[in-house]
Amino acid sequence: GSTVPPMVNVTRSEASEGNITVTCRASSFYPRNIILTWRQDGVSLSHDTQQWGDVLPDGNGTYQTWVATRICRGEEQRFTCYMEHSGNHSTHPVPSGNSHHHHHHHH
């Protein structure tokens, strides 16, 4: 099949006091190989500070996955989600506290 670029969506949720969990989801992409990882101030976070979902079929012949990490509230602007798929790449910021969803479709 032809390349289908992912939809990338960054959300935040309350974790413990002073911390939030930020999750970067990629969906509706093909082929299944995708890089999704968090950066802080442009530097990659270690594997042991991130949690990944498996790359799973979403029922439409395309795939979905996610990566999450826990950060200190107030430091959201230091973190970005990096996505690389089929030679295309993009970075996605954490939404501010009053906005919980950012959707981007990449071509």
Epitope: G42, S44, S46, H47, D48, W52, V55, Y82, H89
Partner: antibody, heavy 120, light 107 residues
Framework: QVQLKESGPGLVAPSQSLSITCTVS????????VNWVRQPPGQGLEWLGM???????DYNSALKSRLSISKDNSKSQVFLKMNSLQTDDTARYYC??????????????WGAGTTVTVSS | DIQMTQTTFSLSASLGDRVTISCSAS??????LNWYQQRPDGTVKLLIY???TLPSGVPSRFSGSGSGTDYSLTISNLEPEDIASYYC?????????FGGGTKVEIK
């Protein structure tokens, strides 16, 4: 066929800088990361740093102040520059393609390496 | 940095033998471990990633296992072309670090 090939100066004088080029084929640098690893004679392997598809770089903090990694996507070349070389920088320098998929991160194809000797 | 220790610097075995190479990490690495083979001419090849996954083209006589801090690589039936040094590598924390290597020789 995925290939990487390093080319370097061979001999570098102490306190001088080192420049090595990694020329790749069979894949695009916009869609893959490239790592640099070195091996001093008779010793183990040491990761130096990497450059991602978007040009962002990560470095080994022990060497970060002396290292610079860059690339030219159109020429399929990745460059390693290291400053202030000393004799303990004598090593074989490898470039290797990185595969970074979720919980899996590995160096799936390596160049043959280029030997760098630091000596006056 | 995480220290990776391969306590056996070299070992001698006969062709057809089962060979096990051990690797220990200075802290838990959550299966974030790869193995590489370095031939005498310096050529490096990926053997196993994420503790136990074999890349395509790697013979099935190679296998990997482990968890927490302790990992191993097993060659079930030593062949002449397996004469090489073997390195473990963790990627749980940056920087990725390698063990000191285990050299396998023929008796």
């Amino acid at each position: 066929q995925v290939q990487l090939k390093e080319s370097g100066p061979g001999l570098v004088a102490p306190s001088q800088s080192l420049s090595i080029t990694c020329t790749v084929s069979g894949f695009s640098l916009t869609g893959s990361g490239v790592n640099w690893v070195r091996q001093p004679p008779g010793q183990g392997l040491e990761w130096l740093g990497m450059i991602w598809g978007d040009g962002n770089t990560d470095y080994n903090s022990a060497l970060k102040s002396r290292l610079s990694i860059s690339k030219d996507n159109s020429k399929s070349q990745v460059f390693l520059k290291m400053n202030s070389l000393q004799t303990d920088d004598t090593a074989r320098y490898y470039c290797a393609r990185g595969a970074h998929y979720g919980k899996r991160w590995y160096f799936d194809v390596w160049g043959a390496g280029t030997t760098v000797t630091v000596s006056s | 940095d995480i220290q990776m220790t391969q306590t056996t610097f070299s070992l001698s075995a006969s062709l057809g033998d089962r060979v096990t190479i051990s690797c220990s990490a200075s802290q838990g690495i959550n299966n974030y471990l790869n193995w590489y083979q370095q031939r005498p001419d310096g050529t490096v090849k990926l053997l196993i990633y994420y503790t136990s996954t074999l890349p395509s083209g790697v013979p099935s006589r190679f296998s990997g296992s482990g968890s927490g801090t302790d990992y191993s690589l097993t060659i079930s039936n030593l062949e002449p072309e397996d004469i090489a040094s073997y390195y473990c590598q963790q990627y749980s924390k940056l920087p990725p670090t390698f063990g000191g290597g285990t050299k396998v020789e023929i008796k």
